[in-house]
């Protein structure tokens, strides 16, 4: 069963800034990836950004870069500033497309004891909806 | 969360007409597109119409002047009209909501399908 983890952390230069890395684990070809935060895609969160593997990436404030690190991982740097900043409580989700196929995703947050700069290596997170 | 069900789909002659429904509930922010994307039987996937968040529709080559699409925002839904429906046009027809990248919708969530059979 294809899963998908998600990676919250903090930059120890800029405390309000946060990079977010998400991973598919499955064999199946990705056709769409979106990272949102407050909830999961279509259900209540905010799209930060979208990146198709070949026509391109749309992003919105706060996120300042995405990108794609694999052809099944991606990551997105935000910047905090103001209203729009996000705090260390903030869930992030990523859902992975596959159209017809079906999409996964999964949420992550900063953990609670983490300190700026530090993470652990990338964990496969629960999957909260396979369609 | 986003569920798209299409229905109208089924047998019909060649040169007949089908009309596609697809009813849309809850929503994904910043979504700016909604259409119909269609796979043949061992065939790739194909976009098929969109409607971009500007209202404008846009059509794949193949179906210009025979298919229109469109959508009642009041329903939530979202329309396939298909005139002078010819064999190649059967597929399993999907509705889509997704993000726009140029002139292509990229489908971010969908239906489960409904087949389209042209057939005499």
């Known amino acids: 069963t294809p899963e998908v983890w998600v990676q919250v952390r903090m930059e120890a230069t800029e405390l309000s800034s946060f990079t977010i890395r998400c991973g598919f684990l499955g064999s199946g070809s990705i056709s769409l990836v979106t990272v949102s935060w407050g909830g999961p895609n279509g259900a209540g969160g905010t799209t930060l950004a979208v990146l198709h593997p070949e026509r391109g990436i749309r992003q919105w404030a706060p996120a300042r870069q995405a990108r794609w690190e694999t052809q099944s991982s991606i990551s997105l740097i935000l910047e905090g500033s103001g209203a729009s900043s996000p705090c260390a409580n903030t869930t992030f989700c990523c859902k992975f497309a596959s159209f017809p196929e079906g999409s996964w995703e999964a949420c992550g947050s900063l953990p609670p004891s983490s300190d700026p700069g530090l993470s652990a290596p990338p964990t496969p997170a629960p999957i909260l909806r396979a369609d | 969360e986003v569920q798209l069900v299409e229905s109208g789909g089924g047998l019909v002659q060649p040169g007949g007409s089908l009309r596609l429904s697809c009813a849309a509930s809850?929503?994904?922010?910043?979504?700016?597109?909604m259409g119909w994307f269609r796979q043949a039987p061992g065939k790739g996937l194909e976009g098929v119409a969109h409607?971009?968040?500007?209202?404008?529709?846009r059509y794949v080559e193949s179906v210009k002047g025979r298919f229109t699409i469109s959508r009642d925002n009041a329903k939530n839904s979202l329309y396939l009209q298909m005139n002078s429906l010819r064999a190649e046009d059967t597929a399993v027809y999907y509705c889509?909501?997704?993000?726009?990248?140029?002139?292509?919708?990229?489908?971010?969530?969908w239906g489960q399908g409904t087949m389209v059979t042209v057939s005499s």
């Open positions: 889509v909501v997704g993000f726009k990248f140029g002139d292509y919708c990229a489908p971010n969530d």
């Open positions: 809850g929503f994904t922010s910043r979504t700016d597109c």
């Open positions: 409607i971009d968040s500007d209202g404008i529709p």
